[in-house]
Amino acid sequence: VPEKSVRWCAVSEHEATKCQSFRDHMKSVLPSNGPSVACVKKASHLDCIRAIAANEADAVTLDAGLVYDAYLAPNNLKPVVAEFYGSKEDPQTFYYAVAVVKKDSDFQMNQLRGRKSCHTGLGRSAGWNIPIGLLYCDLPEPRKPLEKAVANFFSGSCVPCADGTDFPQLCQLCPGCGCSTLNQYFSYSGAFKCLKDGAGDVAFVKHSTIFENLANKADRDQYELLCLDNTRKSVDEYKDCHLARVPSHTVVARSVGGKEDLIWELLNQAQEHFGKDKSKEFQLFSSPHGKDLLFKDSAHGFLKVPPRMDAKMYLGYEYITAIRNLREGTCPEAPTDECKPVKWCALSHHERLKCDEWSVNSAGKIECESAETTEDCIAKIMNGEADAMSLDGGFVYIAGMCGLVPVLAENYNTPNPNCENTAEEGYFAVAVVKSSSDLTWDNLKGKKSCHTAVGRTAGWNIPMGLLYSKINHCRFDEFFSEGCAPGSEKNSSLCKLCMGPSPNLCEPNNKEGYYGYTGAFRCLVEKGDVAFVKHQTVPQNTGGKNPDAWAKNLKEEDYELLCLDGSRKSVQEPANCHLARAPNHAVVARKDKADCVQTLLLDQQRMFGSSVTDCSSNFCLFESKTKDLLFRDDTVCLAKLHDRNTYEKYLGEEYVKAVTNLRKCSTSPLLEACTF
């Protein structure tokens, strides 16, 4: 197989014919050293998936349900290119499966038992697989056959294409369960009509269905969406209130050696030459000998799936939960309203040790999951492999963009017993220099910089945001002569100053000696000119408070703060000499786990929080000898957020704006994936 050949998998004679035409037309427009198409014919999409996994083919386009099959072991395929619909300016690559109800009804998602339901059709994604998959564990036992369990759950339904003889209740609202438009309640518009006519109480459809059927906003306002957290939202808030986000049609490839760049190069060229309204002789998104051959006829083009986006992230936690429930038919033994153990995400092995000790002391109420970077931990929380972790504000922003929510804030200044109910204003992000140097905020160019990590508040977002507005470009590695900013590209000058050890050099976790607040300060002490940290860092690591060899003899008066007006002040005056106020670190979780995480953590801190005085012979949640493991060591308590329960409200408008501006310079692959 030539290096630059993409072997496309076709699943019928008609697809194979179109594939050959695709191959021939691409040959005519691409240079001889460009990508080429070869065609491989298989009997089914599942056979194509297996062929790609076995390196007998390279690519195929799949519906969401098959993307799930492709991702499962031993296939391990991943999404590489997505079809989009709508316009190039506003490309739609996903749709949202929603539960629509009338505004004047008064039930929530957890009160659907005994209601009347309207479905698009048996076995269809938005109308059946997703809602029934998510409700699966609430269905009466035995749950097989599924249709019988659903019939016994709702008091009556319309499920087009169901067997009305065996399951008459599923056809109660549409006698005969007709499987075509002859049934007035068939498909998306039909299911919505079933609700509109008053036959059913809830309709399971796509987010766009209501807009396609009700042009008038006043009419739409008579309806609401049921959210998974047992609240309701208006129909235009579907991005924040849906059952699942479903990818429309996706090209998949091998996770390793999958030729994803070549596939993108090929499809990008293909859409330029043979996309919508591009060519008369061959059209990529048209199927003269059938329907949706190789690609959907309704597609308008392709978008490259960000490299950080694996199948789990692409399909989403809700979709995978629904499909897994349906396929595997397993439900937890515990009632669903009881909190299961919370899986904490620990960064690298130092945090894992502390988490393990916490787990033992919590009698298993806390379990531990590990990842090498904060972004990997956030991804694990998104896909359900972990449940929660505490994050710096910069990562609260990324987590929020990825659909996670803040649950509790770390408080640093409020003494107990008021701590748990107090919303603190935040801490100061400062620039620290040695008293002996002549540095000011205005002459940092060419100096050596020390940062907590890329993407963190005090160490990166605030100082680099301020710097960006001064220099108007993102080449921070050219502004400083060298530095240590863990998480930077390994060959960047901003990794040059890092201490490692070697394989962990510049990694954004505690294996890198200059990571975090203490690490950045150590970098200043040993090699750097300026450290970007929190205002408490110098006092916490001087005067013998940090017993480590590098810190035990340090004096607070040997360090000063840089003020934005070009002056310098004592480290005792952060209120009058700081770069900005930073939001406190916060615990984040998935929405569905937020209440359990909050309840458990408040309970845990009563046992292991700052009320424990002897940490040498007791487990202390907020102690790790200046290393800020799992939580900042200066945490007094975890505090309730009250109404600051979204990332925007928690971080505040000003900080969100600053980080959004800095996104031009973003090196966050996760943020790129979450905003796809």
Epitope: E351, L353, V360, N361, S624, K625, L629
Partner: nanobody, 117 residues
Framework: EVQLVECGGGLVQPGGSLRLSCAAS????????MAWYRQAPGQQRELVAG???????KYADSVKGRFTISRDNAKNTLYLQMNSLKPEDTAVYYC???????????WGQGTQVTVSS
């Protein structure tokens, strides 16, 4: 600082039993949490079982019902009773008391357990 020395490992057939001991050089009465970890070739070190001073225990899912952790403060010893051993239990087993903080790498020699027919 208390030193810990593991022993009791060996070669055992699937279904067999072993009892690991971890002897401390000083008093463990004031040590809150003690634990057994294991590391198989090419794998990360993982928590097998832990016990607090008050006797609260936690086990990895893979060993629940087969392994039992206990401590004898009078003898300054931590134990791990391993029954119904499986080939996948093959690893070097280490004990720790977390008392040196989480940051230093302070593992002892460990004791090798091999489960094979």
């Amino acid at each position: 600082e208390v030193q810990l020395v593991e022993c009791g490992g060996g070669l055992v057939q699937p279904g067999g039993s072993l009892r690991l001991s971890c002897a401390a050089s000083g008093s463990i009465a004031s040590i809150n949490t003690m634990a057994w970890y294991r590391q198989a070739p090419g794998q990360q070190r993982e928590l097998v079982a832990g016990i607090t001073r008050g006797g609260s225990t936690k086990y990895a899912d893979s060993v629940k019902g087969r392994f039992t952790i206990s401590r004898d403060n009078a003898k300054n010893t931590l134990y791990l009773q391993m029954n119904s051993l499986k080939p996948e239990d093959t690893a070097v087993y280490y004990c720790t008391d977390y008392s040196r903080g989480y940051y230093q790498d302070y593992w002892g020699q460990g004791t090798q357990v091999t489960v094979s027919s």
